[in-house]
């Protein structure tokens, strides 16, 4: 269950892959496309609104946190639309919906090496948002060693990951190397 209905905090960041390809969200009323590609030099990067929630989980489950608490996020590229995990089709989709959001819109946030994060499906532990054939897709990760596989690693730019210290506290990080690399900055956005 997610502790409380309101997020702990929210901030804006542009999302890119481990290889620095940008994620662009092309939404129309009846259709959408999510581009994963090298962005032109003069083009503005899309941003997503990340809403952070604290989740109570059994302590044996993976995730960044202590005492069985984990950070979960929802990702919204524009008002009223959220990324959803479609586990049946192994796809990442954009859906318009009202709060409270369905479980498919929640992802466990993992802080990885090299200032990267990964997003694990709340509805399907071991399955992560990843990049496949220049599209976002759901990718099954078989073992903890594969958590560092490049295609499930993402960068959140224009952020200052130290802000995570405020959310979970520096002591909550499992890996000391990650502490130095993460300084997330807190952005407010009024839409």
């Amino acid at each position: 269950s997610i502790t409380g209905i309101s997020p702990i905090t929210e901030y804006l960041a542009s999302l890119s892959t481990y290889n620095d390809q940008s994620i662009t969200f092309a939404l129309e009323d009846e259709s959408y496309e999510i581009y994963v590609e090298d962005l032109k030099k003069d083009e503005k990067k899309d941003k997503v609104l990340l809403s952070y929630y604290e989740s109570q989980h059994p302590s044996n489950e993976s995730g960044d946190g202590v005492d069985g608490k984990m950070l979960m996020v929802t990702l919204s590229p524009t008002k009223d639309f959220w990324l959803h995990a479609n586990n049946k089709e192994h796809s990442v989709e954009l859906h318009k919906c009202e709060k409270p959001l369905p479980d498919q819109a929640f992802f466990v946030l993992h802080n990885m090496h090299s200032n990267c994060v990964s997003f694990e499906c709340k509805t399907d532990p071991g399955v992560f948002i990843g990049v496949k054939d220049n599209h976002l897709a759901l990718i099954k990760v078989d073992s903890s060693e594969n958590l560092c596989t490049e295609n499930i690693l993402f960068k959140l730019s224009e952020t200052n990951p130290a802000f995570l210290y405020k959310v979970v506290g520096a002591a909550d990080y499992k890996d000391d190397d990650d502490k130095a690399a993460h300084h997330h900055h807190h952005h407010h956005h009024h839409h």
Epitope: F25, L27, E28, K40, K44, D46, K47, P77
Partner: antibody, heavy 126, light 106 residues
Framework: EVQLLESGGGLVQPGGSLRLSCAAS????????MSWVRQAPGKGLEWVSG????????YYADPVKGRFTISRDNSKNTLYLQMNSLRAEDTAVYYC???????????????????WGQGTMVTVSS | SYVLTQPPSVSVSPGQTASITCSGE??????AAWYQQKPGQSPVLVIY???KRPSGIPERFSGSNSGNTATLTISGTQAMDEADYYC?????????FGGGTKLTVL
């Protein structure tokens, strides 16, 4: 079906004012940035002004800065262009245009213009 | 201000390939769009993001963009393709159009 219907054009004297409207339907108006583009008789297209999600996110071409004001009323699904201190060189067909994609939290316009209205003619002459 | 330059006119025989260029400083660093405008009608988007076609636009329309030049290519040109064509970009939340090219199908 996306529809954009401009109105408010007409004949006005130099120095006069005019307010153009663009009634939108067939899409979630509040989710898209909108622009005005004009075309003088026998000439090419010229972008005039654009507006994103609120009154602070407005953009203008240099020739109209300080004279034209773009605004939107999301409750009425309508885009406006208030034109003051009109000059002969403002004579043109004025098109209302919708960005192809919905706005993103990065803000600003999301080129290109995917849909256009039929235009309304503005003539500035004494 | 940013300037996009197009040839005023291009002629092509039916069934042949027409190419319309649009030049601007570091054009390849921006995403180009192309609009078709027939006499007495509103412009219609035919290419966006350099190479992508909106639904309903025939496959014979294609685009490219690199260096200082974007190009609209119409293969197997038909009489109905006769129109004015405008390139455009967005530069710092300001729309910029080329001067337009009149495509004549002989």
């Amino acid at each position: 079906e996306v529809q954009l219907l401009e109105s408010g054009g007409g004949l006005v004297q130099p120095g006069g004012s005019l307010r153009l409207s663009c009634a939108a339907s067939g899409f979630t108006f509040s989710s898209y940035a909108m622009s005005w583009v004009r075309q003088a008789p026998g000439k090419g297209l010229e972008w005039v002004s654009g507006i994103a999600d609120d009154f602070t996110s407005t953009y203008y071409a240099d020739p109209v800065k300080g004279r034209f004001t773009i605004s939107r009323d999301n409750s009425k699904n309508t885009l406006y262009l208030q034109m003051n201190s009109l000059r002969a060189e403002d004579t043109a067909v004025y098109y209302c245009a919708r960005d192809l994609w919905m706005m993103n939290y990065a803000g600003g316009l999301r080129y290109p213009f995917g849909y256009w209205g039929q235009g309304t003619m503005v003539t500035v002459s004494s | 201000s940013y300037v996009l330059t197009q040839p005023p006119s291009v002629s092509v025989s039916p069934g042949q390939t027409a190419s319309i260029t649009c030049s601007g400083e570091r054009m390849g660093d921006k995403y180009a769009a192309w609009y078709q405008q027939k006499p007495g009608q509103s412009p219609v988007l035919v290419i966006y993001r350099d190479t992508k076609r909106p639904s309903g636009i025939p496959e014979r329309f294609s685009g490219s963009n690199s260096g200082n030049t974007a190009t609209l290519t119409i293969s197997g040109t038909q009489a109905m393709d006769e129109a004015d064509y405008y390139c455009g970009v967005l530069k710092q939340d300001t729309g910029v159009f080329g001067g337009g090219t009149k495509l004549t199908v002989l």
